[in-house]
């Protein structure tokens, strides 16, 4: 079972120094600052799920050296920045989408000995990202998001 933590009850101030090992900003309708880093030097798990995020400003994640899990589920991502993808030790939780192609390519080219990358469909089933991209994002296919008919990853 993945660890969890509750949301801060107040509005998020990006100037705050967060001391916790887990931060939950899910479902807050947040927009991430473009030129400011999240100040959370202890954080292992950052939950940004359900915020309608399309872009991930790379500066925002720059100082999160301890980050292990980044939950981006239920965000309509248009792409994943290469610098973020190149963090080989970062576990990304994201919806199955062709926008993850860049993430997959950067990992494949830069990170050796990795466990298979996964993505999640609308029913919360895990899929092998490589298999999903092959089936759903071949050249000429329209951008796809995950649905229930791909192989279930065990």
């Amino acid at each position: 079972q993945e660890p969890s933590c509750t949301m801060p009850s107040t509005d998020v101030d990006w100037n705050t120094e967060f001391s916790a090992t887990c931060l939950n900003f899910s479902g807050r309708g947040l927009s991430l600052p473009l030129n400011q880093s999240l100040r959370a030097s202890n954080v292992l798990l950052l939950d940004l799920s359900g915020n309608g995020l399309r872009e991930l400003p790379v500066t925002f994640f720059a100082h999160l050296q301890k980050l292990e899990v980044l939950n981006l589920l239920h965000n309509p991502l248009s792409r994943v920045d290469g610098a973020l993808a190149a963090r080989c030790d970062l576990d990304l939780r994201a919806d199955c989408s062709c926008a993850l192609e860049s993430w997959h390519e950067v990992r494949r080219d830069n990170c050796s000995g990795q466990k298979p990358l996964l993505c999640w469909d609308t029913t919360s089933f895990q899929h092998n990202l490589s298999a999903f991209l092959e089936v759903s994002c071949a050249p000429g296919l329209a951008p796809a998001t995950g649905s229930g008919h791909h192989h279930h990853h065990h």
Epitope: Q1, E2, P3, S4, C5, T6, S19, A20, T21, C22, N24, S41, N42, L44, L45, Q65, K66, E68, V69, D89, D91, K115
Partner: antibody, heavy 125, light 107 residues
Amino acid sequence: QITLKESGPGILQPSQTLSLTCSFSGFSLTTSGMGVSWIRQPSGKGLEWLAHIYWDDDKRYNPSLRSRLTISKDTSSNQVVLKLTNVDTADTATYYCARRARDYYNSGHWYFDVWGAGTTVTVSS
Amino acid sequence: DVVMTQTPKSMSMSVGERVTLSCKASENVGTYVSWYQQKPDQSPKLLIFGASNRYTGVPDRFTGSGSATDFTLTISSVQAEDLADYHCGQTYSFPFTFGSGTKLEIK
């Protein structure tokens, strides 16, 4: 097999500096997510976390002892050293080092999976 | 600092009985709580992490539950070898803190 073993002076006098060494094997303190903490336990009492050192040499300390504590690592000899200055009888305890490892199938968790047997430290005049 | 309060301080149970140990945090720590077993003259050993995940090799009679501020360690059918002190600890925020422990004695 993963092991940690603490060593220290056993007995020392008030105002002296306590130096403790944690020698470990079976893992590398250069691996991402890896770290070692020092935790102490006065006889018959609970556990008190003292300090942690990360794989990237980042350090965290218990604020109540921050001014007296220094943690360091020597990755080539697989050792972590804790120094506690100006000791008092209240520092008499068993001192443990414990490992925090990243479990790639349980990422984001923080727990101490392996502990040393402990070393007993007595501060007495 | 987060204060972890364990109850009871000690308890005496017969083999086969169900044991429930409580740990309360002074503030919300999510599921960042671990349970450790410390047998006499030994170092602590990890039983449960993430409030409810049983560590490798731990017998399935040990179960952890809870989140936020209230946590429980349950031993479904206590055995003679379970004689030990049990410690809960939080790793949600620095400084990490532990409860004062519960001593389990076997009748």
